[in-house]
Structures are given as structure tokens and as C-alpha cells.
Interface confidence: low
């Protein structure tokens, strides 16, 4: 903190406010009576410079005028934009243990003078809005700058307002506060910034305008629509503007979307039809306006509607599938299963669905509904059986989907060739076929059909499936697909009455299974040991299991074991093998192999045969 | 099932700040609208902001609109709602919810499949 200067006094030449560049000559005078009380001899004055109160610079080899003991002068160079404080100090050279007096400061200010203020904009926000002006300042000038806005128009009309720039706030726009009314539309209005700092001031070019030219009209508001007769795709789109708006922009899209649907309408007067909206839609709604077809600015857009267009009948077919399971000798279980439409083709939300099972013959029919997308029913095994499902919502149903009843894998000569499945990635499974070799008649489509094979799938969940034109033979199916679970895969061939199907095992990922199988029994029948298992839980198998291996050696021996692999099916859990000795010792394992690999050896079992030896 | 856990809550100063996170359980989290609500006592749930097709889209509220940043990290599984220039008003309880994305009703809670269990924001002096 520098006293108040009781000491001496500092000035500057040729002022404290220098342009970038220049030098300054900084004097610092002690009053009469001050000083060192020795004698004035030893009076030494010294010149410290600081930037953000920091001490930077020593000045002493600086001097370029020295009255001893009175008064010193300075030259000071290179100072950087901005602000400089500079204090002078006395020092008594003969008393080195007292510190150097603060005499008195200056600050000095390096700036530049103001650019001329370039690329004046005015606006005008509504009819009853007032003017406001932006500029472009120019480069920095470091200084308090002084900037005057002036408009001049028709009638004398003139009006001014100032704002200053500084190191805390920055002035490039002034609100006028006078609004221009349309009865001005064709006069012409001039604004100019005028700006001055220390080091000199400025005036942009003059900036010509009409009253159209600033006017931006408020965004239209109180945004409405109306559904003609409940429609779902048609609707009427109201709003408020103000008096003058001759033409407006609408756009809209669904909430979905990312591109905008767009209208011009001219003399709108607040109202438009919309013809092309999709039924059951959440949609959002903007609008803008102008006061003049080819001149003026658009307004900011309005705030959004969003509201949902109504329902409408579904369109589109529901894709059904089914599954027949023969109950006894005259008795048939029948399940449908139907994929739900999607949005557009739903149109609403899906009430219920209509399911007709009829025998074509005997003109038998079944008929339900049902909200879920699966429907069983028992039936006789005798007849020609289709079916039918259609989709319902609040306006209506969906023209019904048939599909003829046929035994799916019932003709052989139907199923598909060469089918095999090889795993994409993580979530996908690509199957490829070859078309039957042998059909009778022509096949109208491929079913994909897939179900994870765990334990009560086939009860507990629905299949997924996938529809193939006749002339593709290859699906990838990603639907419900997760790495390390084996999937049964059935590719169905349909003509017109009957199906025929071939059936494969395949995975998305795999790894070696985390366990072997577990033996629970070994039993001896007719000199041949039946090795009995339980199969590795599903969890652990961690893909399509491939086959398994019996190993066995004799207890106590050091040699390889012997092993026997079986082809892996899920119905079996038993195998013979007949090249053991008779009353000698064997230990017994299995291990499960997958295409990643094998797993590590299940339980150990000991057994002695006590038959013949082959 | 998608299991979600919101963090990042706590008391705050009006004109302060506070992130909140939103982590999923599961990988089928870019195939999903994740969506922020808030509750304040003896109010409804009332919708905060969304962010739709692994970020591409947003909406906010009005009432939030300038202040609240929401975002997405698909590679983490994690939804964030970054709010500044927080007002008293603002004091609820912020839930995380996410929906298979229809396009139907964003800011209706009944269209959103799973949520998480809620972090309490207060501001207050």
C-alpha cells in the first residue's frame, strides 16, 4: 500500500496513458525538508516496477537524470498491455539495516486507440419490441473505452445511447429503447458507433436501414391442433400471431426423427392443414414468421407442441407361426404364435387379437380373443386345419392373417439339405441351407425357427422365428441370441400342404464346459459295461456340446487311459463298452467337448468286471 | 431385466452445481431412451430431460432448459444429468428410467420400462 504521498511526488511524461510501444520518463521529486536527516547526500531514490501486485523489475540502472539526493528521472520501456504500477522509494545508503521508504507511485496504462466498430446489426424483437444494436468492436484496446450508438430518421427523429468497455465488462450492444412502428415501414433509418478511449476515438460507417429490415416478429404462440373427425393422419394446426405476419414456416416430425418435415404457408392466418401425419404418433410441432414475403427476418422459432395424432385401424400382417404336438391317437395340441406389429403398422395400441382355427372341410371353426401373441387350443388329428389372426385396436382390426395347419416335418422329402450354422459374433447365428433335392410340390417359403436348449424351453418359452423367401437359403438370426447357450435350430421347408424340416445344433460363442458329465452307474449286462451319466447342467455346458469322451485305465497304472467318444445326444445318458479286462480294477471319467474344447474330467468312478474276457 | 443405480446426489447451494450418474446393468443400454424425473413432496413425478439414440437427441423440460446437460456414455452403460445454476426449486428426488425407444410420450413416466431407485438433491442456503 503506498501512503498517501507525504514524501515526494511521481510524474509521467508525456502521461500515464501510453500507447503499445512507446516509452515513458517517470520523475520522482522528494518534498522540500524530506529525505535522509544526515544530510542529503545520501539520499538515493530507486524505482520499482510491479505487475499484479508482483515485483518485477528493479529499475535502477534506468536512470536518466539524477539530481543527488532530490530528484531522479527514469526511462521506462517495453511495458506490456495494460496496467503497470510503478513506486518510487527512498533509500538512506548510510543506514543499510533500515528498509527502503515508499516516496510515492503511478500507475501507467499501454493501450491502443478503438478500431473503428464494424458489422452493425439492429433489431427489432416484435411489433411493440424496441431497437437494439450490435457491433463488432475490434481489436482490444485495454483502455476504458467509450462507445455511442446514434440513430437518426424521418421527422428529426434522433436518439442516443453510451455504454462503456472495460476489463470487467465488455460493450458491443445498446437497447435504444424507442420502437419503430409499421406506419415507418418504408422509411429509412441511419445508425453509427462512435468510440473513444485516451488514445484516440472512432466511428464506424454509417448503417442504413428499413423498418422491415430489423423487425423480427415474435414466434407465433398459443399453438394448438385439431384431429378432423378424430382422424389420425389429418389435422388442422392453429396458432397466435401478431397483426402484420404475412407468411409462416411450420415444421414437424416425430418425436423419433431427426429431420424435419417442412411447410410455407402464405396469408396462414393462423391456421394450416396437415394431411401426411402418421396415425398413433407423438409429433412435435414448431412454427416461425415473417411480416413480408421477400424481405425481413424470420422470427425464432415457436415453443414446440407435442402432442399424439389418434389411433387408426391396424394395416399390415401379423407374422404367425405354430407348433403341433400329438396328445394321443385322435387328439392334437395346436399353438399359434404371432409377432407383434410394429408402430406403424399398429396404429394404435393393440386391444386384443381375433384367433379363428376352422377345418376346411367340415367347416368347424374356433374362434377367441386374446391380448396375449399366443393362443392354444386341442383339436382333432383328422381334417385340413388353417388358421387366422388379426390385430384390433380402438378403431378397428387388421385384415386377418391365414396360414394352413401342415405336419411341419412330416415329408421328407420337403427338408432342406446341407443345413448348417456358424456362429457371426456374439449375437448372431448365420444358418445356410441347400433346397430340397426330391419336392413333389414347389416351396413357397423357409421358416428359421430357434429355441435355447435348456431344460422346458419348448413349455416355457415361445420359439423365435424368422420368414425366408423360396429363393434365399440363408437367415441371420440375432433375436434373443446369447453367447455360450446352445440353440436347436429347425429350418422348415412349406409348400402349399405339407412341411418338411431338417434340425441342427449351433451357438453364437463358445468355450470349453465348465464341467464333465457326472457318471452315476456302471452296470455289467452280457460281458459289455453300460456306463450311465447325468448331463452337465446347463449353465455350465457354455455352447453346442459336441460329443463325449469315456476314459478309462486301470487303477494304479501310470499308462494312458483308454477313451471312447460318443457322438452327443440329448436323449441318451447311457453307452456300452466291452474292451475291459475281467476282475481287474479300472477307474472311469468323462469329459464334454465343445468346439472350443474339452471340459476338465467329471466325478471318478471305480468298477472291477467280473465277466469273461472278450 | 435392466438393473439401474443412480449416484451423484447430496445438498448444494443455490447457483451451485452437481453431476448425477446413472449406471445400467446391461449391454442393451444404447437400444434404450434413458431419462431423468424428479419428485419433490407431495408432487407428482415430473420429467427432467432425455436422451435418445446414444445421445444424438435430446429434450429438456422448460423448467430446466439452459441449466441441465444431460448425456450419455454407451461404453460405459451410464447416463449423466449435469445441473448448474441450481435453484431451490429444484429440490426433488431424481430418478434414472429407461424405455425401449417407440418414439411415444417421452415425458409420461407410464412409457418407461425400468428405474432406479432415486438420489435425493436438495438446494438450500
Known amino acids: 500500500n503506498i501512503d498517501v504521498c507525504k514524501l515526494g511526488t511521481v510524474t509521467v511524461q508525456p502521461a500515464p496513458v501510453i500507447p503499445l510501444g512507446s516509452a515513458a520518463n517517470i520523475s520522482c521529486s522528494l518534498n522540500p525538508k524530506q529525505g535522509c536527516s544526515h544530510y542529503p547526500s545520501s539520499n538515493e531514490l530507486i524505482l520499482l516496477k510491479f505487475v499484479n501486485d508482483v515485483l518485477v523489475e528493479n529499475l535502477h540502472g534506468k536512470k536518466v537524470h539524477d539530481h543527488t539526493g532530490h530528484s531522479s528521472t527514469f526511462q521506462v520501456t517495453n511495458l506490456s498491455l495494460g496496467m503497470t504500477l510503478f513506486v518510487c522509494k527512498l533509500n538512506c545508503s548510510n543506514s543499510q539495516k533500515k528498509p527502503p521508504v515508499p516516496v510515492c507511485g503511478v500507475e501507467i496504462s499501454v493501450g491502443v486507440a478503438p478500431e473503428p466498430p464494424q458489422n452493425i446489426s439492429c433489431v427489432q424483437e416484435g411489433e411493440n419490441g424496441t431497437v437494439a444494436c450490435s457491433w463488432n468492436s475490434g481489436k482490444v484496446t485495454y483502455l476504458k473505452t467509450n462507445y455511442t450508438l446514434q440513430l437518426s430518421g424521418p421527422n428529426n427523429l434522433t436518439c442516443q445511447k453510451q455504454c462503456f468497455s472495460d476489463n470487467r465488462q465488455n460493450c458491443n450492444r445498446l437497447d435504444l429503447g424507442i420502437n419503430l412502428s409499421p406506419d415507418l415501414a418504408e422509411s429509412r433509418f441511419i445508425v453509427r458507433v462512435t468510440a473513444i478511449n485516451d488514445l484516440g476515438n472512432s466511428s464506424s460507417l454509417p448503417h442504413t436501414f428499413t423498418f422491415l429490415d430489423i423487425v423480427i416478429p415474435l414466434p407465433p404462440w398459443d399453438i394448438r391442433i385439431n384431429f378432423l373427425n378424430a382422424s389420425g393422419s389429418r389435422g388442422t394446426l392453429q396458432w397466435e400471431d401478431e397483426g402484420q405476419v404475412v407468411l409462416n414456416q411450420l415444421r414437424y416430425q416425430p418425436l423419433n426423427s431427426t429431420s424435419w418435415n417442412m411447410v410455407n404457408a402464405t396469408n396462414a392466418k393462423g391456421k394450416y392443414d396437415l394431411r401426411d401425419l402418421r396415425p398413433f404418433t407423438e409429433y412435435e410441432f414448431q412454427i416461425s414468421s415473417k411480416l413480408h414475403l421477400s424481405g425481413g427476418s424470420w422470427s425464432n422459432w415457436s415453443e414446440s407442441l407435442r402432442t399424439r395424432t389418434p389411433e387408426e385401424e391396424p394395416v399390415g400382417i401379423l407374422d404367425i407361426w405354430y407348433m403341433k404336438q400329438d396328445i394321443d391317437y385322435d387328439r392334437q395340441q395346436i399353438s399359434l404364435f404371432w409377432k407383434s406389429l410394429n408402430p406403424s403398422e399398429a396404429r394404435g395400441k393393440i386391444l386384443h387379437y381375433q384367433v379363428t382355427l376352422q377345418e376346411v372341410t367340415k367347416k368347424t371353426t374356433l374362434q377367441n380373443t386374446t391380448r396375449h401373441t399366443s393362443w392354444t387350443r386341442v383339436i382333432p388329428r383328422t381334417g385340413a386345419w388353417t388358421a387366422s389372426v388379426s390385430a384390433a385396436n380402438s378403431k378397428g382390426a387388421s385384415a386377418p392373417t391365414h396360414i394352413n395347419i401342415v405336419d411341419l416335418c412330416g415329408t421328407g422329402l420337403l427338408a432342406p439339405h446341407q443345413v448348417s450354422a456358424k456362429s457371426e459374433n456374439m449375437d448372431n447365428i448365420l444358418v445356410t441351407w441347400q433346397p430340397p433335392k426330391k419336392a413333389d410340390s414347389a416351396v413357397r417359403e423357409y421358416i428359421v425357427e430357434w429355441r435355447a436348449l435348456q431344460p422346458g424351453s419348448i413349455t416355457k418359452f415361445p420359439p423365435h422365428w424368422l420368414r425366408i423367401p423360396p429363393d434365399n437359403m440363408s437367415a441371420l438370426i440375432s433375436e434373443n441370441i446369447k453367447p455360450y447357450i446352445c440353440y436347436e435350430i429347425r429350418v422348415h421347408a412349406l409348400s402349399e400342404s405339407q412341411g418338411g424340416c431338417s434340425s441342427i445344433r449351433g451357438d453364437s460363442k463358445h468355450k470349453a464346459p465348465v464341467s464333465g458329465p457326472h457318471i452315476t452307474a456302471i452296470t455289467e449286462k452280457k460281458e459289455r459295461l453300460f456306463i450311465s451319466w447325468t448331463h452337465i447342467p446347463f449353465p455350465e455346458q457354455r455352447g453346442c456340446i459336441l460329443h463325449y469322451r469315456i476314459y478309462w485305465k486301470e487303477r494304479d497304472s501310470t499308462a494312458q487311459p483308454e477313451l471312447c467318444e460318443i457322438q452327443y445326444r440329448r436323449s441318451q445318458n447311457s453307452h456300452p463298452i466291452s474292451s475291459l479286462q475281467p476282475r481287474v480294477t479300472y477307474v472311469l471319467w468323462m469329459t464334454a467337448v465343445t468346439a472350443a474344447g474339452e471340459s476338465p474330467q467329471g466325478n471318478e468312478r471305480e468298477f472291477c468286471p467280473q465277466g469273461k474276457a472278450n | 431385466q435392466v438393473q439401474l443405480q443412480e449416484s451423484g446426489g447430496g445438498l448444494v447451494q443455490p447457483g451451485g452445481s452437481l453431476r448425477l450418474s446413472c449406471a445400467a446393468s446391461r449391454r442393451t443400454f444404447s437400444k434404450h431412451a434413458m431419462a431423468w424425473f424428479r419428485q419433490a413432496p407431495g408432487k407428482e413425478r415430473e420429467f427432467v430431460a432425455v436422451?435418445?439414440?446414444?445421445?444424438?437427441?435430446?429434450y429438456y423440460a422448460d423448467s430446466v432448459k439452459g441449466r441441465f446437460t444431460i448425456s450419455r456414455d454407451d461404453a460405459k452403460n451410464t447416463v449423466y444429468l449435469q445441473m448448474d445454476s441450481l435453484k431451490p426449486e429444484d429440490t426433488a428426488v431424481y430418478y434414472c428410467a429407461a424405455g425401449d425407444y417407440r418414439g411415444n410420450g417421452y415425458y409420461v413416466p407410464g412409457m418407461y420400462d425400468y428405474w432406479g431407485q432415486g438420489t435425493q438433491v436438495t438446494v438450500s442456503s
Open positions: 436422451v435418445r439414440w446414444s445421445g444424438i437427441i435430446t
